[in-house]
Interface confidence: low
């Protein structure tokens, strides 16, 4: 049940987002979320997760990359990238001369 809060051991994570109350937080796991909204540069948020574990299994897209880990400050130095979008001229196996 993904909407139940985790009751497992807590881990300390780096917290860098508008919702942070301090430099670290405690949760069931650590998160790094890279989001690109329409017409804006991608923004990376670091924090703690307690709900919706299923998000951790999502594959990166051109709009979001959701990373999870479960050890002390494991999200501190993680850098994410978004799935690159290919224009027809950039597709594999094509020559653009």
């Amino acid at each position: 049940d993904p909407v139940k809060p985790s009751r497992g051991p807590l881990v300390t994570c780096t917290c860098e987002s508008p919702h942070c109350r301090g430099p670290t937080c405690q949760g069931a796991w650590c998160t790094v979320v890279l989001v690109r909204e329409e017409g804006r540069h991608p923004q990376e948020h670091r924090g703690c997760g307690n709900l919706h574990r299923e998000l951790c299994r999502g594959r990166p897209t051109e709009f979001v990359n959701h990373y999870c880990c479960d050890s002390h400050l494991c999200n501190r130095n993680v850098s994410l990238v978004l799935e690159a979008t290919q224009t027809p001229s950039e597709q594999p196996g094509t020559d653009s001369q």
């Epitope: 139940k4 051991p9 951790c56 880990c69 050890s71």
Partner: antibody, heavy 122, light 108 residues
Framework: QVQLQQWGAGLLKPSETLSLTCAVY????????WNWIRQPPGKGLEWIGE???????NYNPSLKSRVTISLDTSKNQFSLKLSSVTAADTAVYYC????????????????WGQGTLVTVSS | SYVLTQPPSVSVAPGQTARITCGGN??????VHWYQQKPGQAPVLVVY???DRPSGIPERFSGSNSGNTATLTISRVEAGDEADYYC???????????FGGGTKLTVL
């Protein structure tokens, strides 16, 4: 390469307390969770519980009232105590590591101890 | 609590493909891990996170997970693959580990 080496008493009487210890070689305590799993003779695997680097624990509800898992970071060891044992607790007991990193959320056991057969008999 | 169901036994001839199933209610979104256990030995992780292999595990071992069934596939089965196989998940509703009952793979 992580190695787990475990030891403890192999023969107990009913109502006694099972006590096992697992030493960790070549691995960092802080990046993993440390687990105990048991296997009764001829049967399947049963997870007992886990402890993390800070000493926080998480136990199988069916055993929770009798189980204590603790760790000694100075010795890179963690221990299992199971109180009030009965014949139903006769099993091979394994210690195991759960790395909890990357995209794996929750436990997966990548390194195991050699196993200790614990027999409970009067 | 969450339950994983495995067939007690699977038999296959050498060189053929063995498929061992692990059933669970809506198991698809969960990460499924598989272990091989030979008599008198500790289990060995052979597939994790549905389909990834730890280093040292042959490519003959693969996994898939969808709907209500996860499957461990062993291609070109060898006599040395004869063992018990267990599936395992993390039950995120209560943060506990769940194992399947195990499947004995017999190589004919």
């Amino acid at each position: 390469q992580v190695q787990l080496q475990q030891w403890g008493a192999g023969l107990l009487k009913p109502s006694e307390t099972l006590s096992l210890t697992c030493a960790v070689y070549g691995g960092s305590f802080s990046s993993s969770y440390w687990n105990w799993i048991r296997q009764p003779p001829g049967k399947g695997l049963e997870w007992i519980g886990e402890v993390n680097h800070s000493g926080s624990t998480n136990y199988n509800p069916s055993l929770k009232s009798r189980v204590t898992i603790s760790l000694d970071t100075s010795k890179n060891q963690f221990s299992l105590k199971l109180s009030s044992v009965t014949a139903a607790d006769t099993a091979v007991y394994y210690c195991a590591r759960s790395p909890r990193s990357g995209r794996i959320v929750g436990a997966v056991f990548d390194y195991w101890g050699q196993g200790t057969l614990v027999t409970v008999s009067s | 609590s969450y339950v994983l169901t495995q067939p007690p036994s699977v038999s296959v001839a050498p060189g053929q493909t063995a498929r061992i199933t692990c059933g669970g209610n809506n198991i698809g979104p969960k990460s499924v891990h598989w272990y091989q256990q030979k008599p008198g030995q500790a289990p060995v992780l052979v597939v994790y996170d549905d389909s990834d292999r730890p280093s040292g595990i042959p490519e003959r071992f693969s996994g898939s997970n969808s709907g209500n069934t996860a499957t461990l596939t062993i291609s070109r089965v060898e006599a040395g693959d004869e063992a018990d196989y267990y599936c395992q998940v993390w039950d995120s509703s209560n943060d506990h580990v769940v194992f399947g009952g195990g499947t004995k793979l017999t190589v004919l």
